[in-house]
């Protein structure tokens, strides 16, 4: 006859407070005749968890029908798990005897430990915007998990980052732990539409990691480039001058025209367009009144972007009868 083996496949079982824990136990033989009981702990002080035949165990149910002929599955479910339930659980075979049943064989035990899921990761970016080619820091925090082992990864647009530092606290034993990670990200000019992702993997998540995201649009400032041009055709005594403000982000922008140093208050036509990379272009048209007698006109397009120092571009209109010559130069 085959020697009886008590199989408890899981060495460790992580459970969450309030949930149901399933403790597995199968036997390889129906002999000797006698019950299978569940205990927590070992020795004379061990706690009886389940006795199929007698006692009161309202939180325990069996996975299979123990009364079925040839049943070899003695797995149990324990409902409404609390921290008091942690410990090592043993399924134990008894041989019927007189006056008492005799313990015959014990399973190797399954340690039940409390697992707590990490909170959804929260990713925070820098307080102020930074221009491309500079490095910014993002922090990711998640709390309340147990056990302490946890994996955190950073991604930028799906590409894993390597420049980050992670801490799990506390270092000693605790009911729950927290993780904090800081990643350093170099900004690219096209990062307006980019995202950084903090991904947390933990045993309680059963292979489905939690993610926190931050948009680089909140962290980046792409300064504009300016170009002022004069339209070749003149309409009557008016010349159309265009100021093109290209590739800036965020949208916050103030544009003013000056004529020979005097700020012009009159209305100007303008259009705002969004580029594929999320940056913006702004085009402003300025009509200049000219006459043959008039001195040379210097036009300045000044742009103040996102509260930064103003930048400007000048264009000198050298007005001749035929309007042949045009030149421009820039000042910061």
């Amino acid at each position: 006859e085959e020697e009886l083996q008590m199989i408890q496949p899981e060495k460790l079982l992580l459970v969450t407070v309030g949930k149901t824990a399933t403790l597995h136990c199968t036997v390889t033989s129906l002999l000797p005749v006698g019950p299978v009981l569940w205990f927590r702990g070992v020795g004379p002080g061990r706690e009886l968890i389940y006795n199929q035949k007698e006692g009161h165990f309202p939180r325990v149910t069996t996975v299979s029908d123990l009364t079925k002929r040839n049943n070899m599955d003695f797995s149990i479910r324990i409902s409404s798990i609390t921290p008091a339930d942690v410990g090592t659980y043993y399924c134990v075979k008894f041989r019927k005897g007189s006056p008492e049943n005799v313990e015959f064989k014990s399973g190797p035990g399954t340690e039940m430990a409390l697992g707590a899921k990490p909170s959804a990761p929260v990713v925070l970016g820098p307080a102020a915007r930074t221009t491309p080619e500079h490095t910014v820091s993002f922090t990711c925090e998640s709390h309340g998990f147990s056990p302490r082992d946890i994996t955190l990864k950073w991604f930028k647009n799906g590409n894993e980052l390597s420049d980050f530092q992670t801490n799990v606290d506390p270092t000693g034993q605790s009911v729950a732990y927290s993780i904090r990670s800081t990643a350093r990200v170099v900004l690219d000019p096209w990062d307006v539409r980019s995202q950084v992702i903090c991904e947390v993997a933990h045993v309680t998540l059963q292979g489905d990691p939690l993610r926190g995201t931050a948009n680089l649009s909140e962290a980046i400032r792409v300064p504009p480039t300016l170009e002022v041009t004069q339209q070749p055709m003149r309409v009557g005594n008016q010349v159309n001058v265009t100021c093109q403000v290209r590739k800036f982000y965020p949208q916050s922008l103030q544009l003013t025209w000056s004529e020979n140093g005097n700020v012009c208050q009159r209305e100007t036509a303008s259009t705002l367009t969004e580029n594929k990379d999320g940056t913006y272009n702004w085009t402003s048209w300025f009509l200049v009144n000219i006459s043959d007698q008039r001195d040379d006109v210097v036009l300045t397009c000044q742009v103040k972007h996102d509260g930064q120092l103003a930048v400007s571009k000048r264009l000198a209109l050298e007005v001749t009868v035929h309007q042949k010559d045009q030149s421009s130069d820039a000042t910061p």
């Epitope: 035949k53 007698e54 006692g55």
Partner: antibody, heavy 113, light 108 residues
Framework: EVQLVQSGAEVKKPGATVKISCKVS????????MHWVQQAPGKGLEWIGR????????KYAPKFQGRVTITADTSTNTAYMELSSLRSEDTAVYYC??????WGQGTLVTVSS | EIVLTQSPATLSLSPGERATLSCSAS???????LYWYQQKPGQAPKLWIY???NLASGIPARFSGSGSGTDYTLTISSLEPEDFAVYYC?????????FGQGTKLEIK
Amino acid sequence: EVQLVQSGAEVKKPGATVKISCKVSGFNIKDYYMHWVQQAPGKGLEWIGRIDPEDAETKYAPKFQGRVTITADTSTNTAYMELSSLRSEDTAVYYCDRGLAYWGQGTLVTVSS
Amino acid sequence: EIVLTQSPATLSLSPGERATLSCSASSSVSSSYLYWYQQKPGQAPKLWIYSTSNLASGIPARFSGSGSGTDYTLTISSLEPEDFAVYYCHQWSSYPYTFGQGTKLEIK
């Protein structure tokens, strides 16, 4: 719903035998030990013994050993307790219980000449 | 045979008072196998506390159980009129199973 319904009161003469039944519903009698407990008038509870209806294995308290027989009929979901050589001190209420958690309503046995 | 001795035999208290019922075993009993039952006149005993400290379904939270080894206690924090009854401790750690002689909790 778990229910244990015991047979009615009995009056017996000393030396006689009494057999009390305990019909259960809401569960299969084979799944649990069935215990019997004695309570003499104005006295405490005393465990008589139990049966495992699955294989008819029994355990008895030494005080009752030799005079008591506990049986079970799994086809009718009924447990029985038979007490022989009755004496006046056997006058008591007898309870059946399922695995120490659910109890029958009790059966009064009066032993009187 | 494990002998269970309950004390006091009778406890006279008023509603609102705290009641402490003791159960002493002649040899060590694993806490998993120590149960308490409540019995009122003319009724069958009812499972009240199982495995030393767990309240059976529907039992009010004013009841609690504690103990280990040979000394066990049932405590009622503030007595209600319906709590006056006889309480029995019971061990099923080893055969023969035994009950204490009971503590009668009566209204003073």
